[in-house]
Interface confidence: medium
Amino acid sequence: MATWALLLLAAMLLGNPGLVFSRLSPEYYDLARAHLRDEEKSCPCLAQEGPQGDLLTKTQELGRDYRTCLTIVQKLKKMVDKPTQRSVSNAATRVCRTGRSRWRDVCRNFMRRYQSRVTQGLVAGETAQQICEDLRLCIPSTGPL
């Protein structure tokens, strides 16, 4: 129960990027799924879809943010050989460019919000999971918030 309350609080603190994320097209999910084989299993905040398939909980909104984060960080990792402040910053200016405009808008929103932290994490050698969990987009797999 306490974990659920903390999740709600975290969701409120994160603002409402869900306004953008809640209207995502199938291409977005295709793009995100490619990077989610192992990560998804260890991310408790990726709640299952409800029986109606249409009502989204706050944990699912966080799950979508987490999917977005993983996709973007993985793409950035592929774009830079040796992560330095400069190389990651340069790659960050282009990371949202591939894909349909709907995905680009989601990516653009994410980068506006988290670019400095993502850059910092990549330079420090953190994994995509570590970076996205540290952004509180998902409960770390080691335990609750």
Epitope: T93, R94, V95, R97, R104, R112
Partner: antibody
Framework: QVKLQESGPDLVKPGASVKISCKAS????????INWVKQRPGQGLEWIGW????????KYNEKFKGKASLTADKSSSTAYMLLNSLTSEDSAVYFC?????????????WGQGTTVTVSS | DIELTQSPTSLAVSLGQRATISCRAS??????????MYWYQQKPGQAPKLLIY???NLESGIPARFSGSGSRTDFTLTINPVEADDVATYYC?????????FGGGTKLEIK
């Protein structure tokens, strides 16, 4: 150095179409979006839309949907804007401009502008 | 659409003095602690030139006489001191929401 070279002025008849070109040099063409901006004589600036030369994806200002069509040719590093069903309202200077930072939205390099005059 | 209103529409300033141009947005142009507001200079017969990006960052090669400030809906471009070469029309632009929009322009002249 970065340069965006636009095609020369065009005098076209009402109802006709015109295709404006914007040749990029001095940078990797597929790494940056090209935006198009309209400026009517003595007036302000209006954003038309952007194209990603890498994959051809586009975003339009609703106002210009059906009026402007954006394309790009990677082999010649050239972006194009086709304007159709021209009227006197379309007489303007059209600029192409590069977005320097993808999640940002500021135009760091501009073409010199192409003047389109619609007259019978 | 976000409407940008610039004031004044024209401005006459003596050489060496300060010029202040205002840009007011119909709604906030802030995203996550950053303001997505830009300033351009356009001289007659030329393309616009980026001066300031994201409210207060000076574009490479632009003299430090130009500065930008503001947040949410109210933004300012300051030129201090004004030089003869600064005679031009200045535009603000937002990229926080599609469609990107520009202000109506402020024409700067020398007294």
């Amino acid at each position: 150095q970065v340069k965006l070279q636009e095609s020369g002025p065009d005098l076209v008849k009402p109802g006709a179409s015109v295709k404006i070109s914007c040749k990029a040099s001095g940078y990797t063409f597929t790494n940056y979006d090209i935006n198009w901006v309209k400026q009517r004589p003595g007036q302000g600036l209006e954003w038309i839309g952007w194209i990603d030369p890498g994959d051809g994806s586009t975003k339009y200002n609703e106002k210009f949907k059906g009026k402007a069509s954006l394309t790009a040719d990677k082999s010649s590093s050239t972006a194009y804007m086709l304007l159709n069903s021209l009227t006197s309202e379309d007489s303007a200077v059209y600029f192409c401009a590069r977005v320097g930072n993808d999640y940002d939205g500021g135009f760091d390099f501009w073409g010199q502008g192409t003047t389109v005059t619609v007259s019978s | 659409d976000i409407e940008l209103t610039q004031s004044p529409t024209s401005l006459a300033v003596s050489l060496g003095q300060r010029a202040t141009i205002s840009c007011r947005a119909s709604e906030s142009v802030d995203s996550y602690g950053d303001s997505f507001m830009y300033w351009y200079q356009q001289k007659p017969g030329q393309a616009p030139k980026l001066l300031i990006y994201r409210t207060s960052n000076l574009e490479s090669g632009i003299p430090a006489r130009f500065s930008g400030s503001g947040s949410r809906t109210d933004f300012t471009l300051t030129i201090n001191p004004v030089e003869a070469d600064d005679v031009a029309t200045y535009y603000c632009q937002q990229s926080n929401e599609y469609p990107y929009t520009f202000g109506g322009g402020t024409k700067l002249e020398i007294k």
